[in-house]
Amino acid sequence: QKSSIEKCSVDIQQSRNKTTERPGLLNCPIYWQQLREKCLLFSHTVNPWNNSLADCSTKESSLLLIRDKDELIHTQNLIRDKAILFWIGLNFSLSEKNWKWINGSFLNSNDLEIRGDAKENSCISISQTSVYSEYCSTEIRWICQKELTPVRNKVYPDS
């Protein structure tokens, strides 16, 4: 017996399989900044982490995912204001007792040097110089991302 979430996931995959080639994002939309193969959008208001996550989705994007220290540094170089904090797509999973990205992967402990505790209701923010653990209810700005690399879905014959 599949859960409703699993059913939904299967339905989405099936509809994807029937889709012909879907071109990816080749250029960043207006107002977005390009950083390598990503487009970034910095908010101009403040929100708790979950509202920030939801707001990025209204822009057909996600909270920022950072692959490694190099990408972190390049992102921080785009931040012009010293004291401003931005949510990214990383929070503490209580069940797994680990930092978890919103795409389901876990943080490689070498990637980010986090200041603060790893505990329940903690989410990760970045500033121009550092990475912080904050209460997810803290109201700060956030960064959305879109992937620039073209996405092409294979065409599968109907089975």
Epitope: Y31, H44, D81, E139
Partner: antibody, heavy 120, light 107 residues
């Protein structure tokens, strides 16, 4: 149509506080961030800070951080700006202004302004 | 803080004239510049966002251009209702700042 209606003019003594209100109509109040901007007589515009009516989160211009408090009452679609320890150079017209987009810093609708005079 | 310097501070012109107002930023602000019009005793009114994008309902005689540190607002053919003070604003940083204004008067 979008309207921001502010409270009436105030005269205050130095050291006192003033609280200005801004009642929004014609749109979903919690859907747009509210900002406060002031204009001293014959001067330019100065941004004071913002409040997200949805969450209540605020961010203030460092210049006013110790003296300003921005709040809101979602039940009556009203934002408030309180400025304490008033000085004569706080004499200005205070405007509420709606942020047009969560990801850009422009103000698409403004209140009519509230004149605050600080005089002994 | 990013300083915005508008020039000229005062401008006299006639109905039908083409006028240009300049806004210079002390640092690169990309395209994050806004233009407002303000009439005496009234609140500012949004004209242009992102250096060149006209707000809905703004007449096509208003146009904006520029990027980086130099921006212009052009009114192609002045109408009587255009005599007002114009302000630029930047939002490249989160401390939003405004120019000192350009007062456009009837010659």
């Amino acid at each position: 149509q979008v309207q921001l209606v502010q409270s009436g003019a105030e005269v205050k003594k130095p050291g006192a506080s003033v609280k200005v209100s801004c009642k929004a109509s014609g749109y979903t109040f919690t859907g747009y961030t509210m900002n406060w901007v002031r204009q001293a007589p014959g001067q330019g515009l100065e941004w004071m800070g913002l409040i997200n009516p949805s969450s209540g989160g605020t961010y203030y211009n460092q210049k006013f951080k110790d003296r300003v408090t921005m709040t809101r009452d979602t039940s009556i679609s009203t934002a408030y700006m309180e400025l304490s320890r008033l000085r004569s150079d706080d004499t200005a017209v205070y405007y509420c202004a709606r942020l047009g987009d969560n990801y850009r810093g422009y103000f698409d609708y403004w209140g009519q302004g509230t004149t605050v005079t600080v005089s002994s | 803080d990013i300083q915005l310097t508008q020039s000229p501070s005062f401008l006299s012109a006639s109905v039908g004239d083409r006028v240009t107002i300049t806004c210079r930023a002390s640092q690169d602000v990309g395209s994050a510049v806004v233009w407002y019009q303000q009439k005496p005793g009234k609140a500012p009114k949004l004209l242009i966002d992102w250096a060149s994008i006209r707000h809905s309902g703004v007449p096509s005689r208003f146009s904006g251009s520029g990027s980086g540190t130099e921006f212009t607002l052009t009114i192609s053919s002045l109408q009587p209702e255009d005599f007002a003070t114009y302000y630029c604003q930047q939002y490249s940083t989160y401390l939003y700042t405004f120019g000192g204004g350009t007062k456009l008067e009837i010659k």
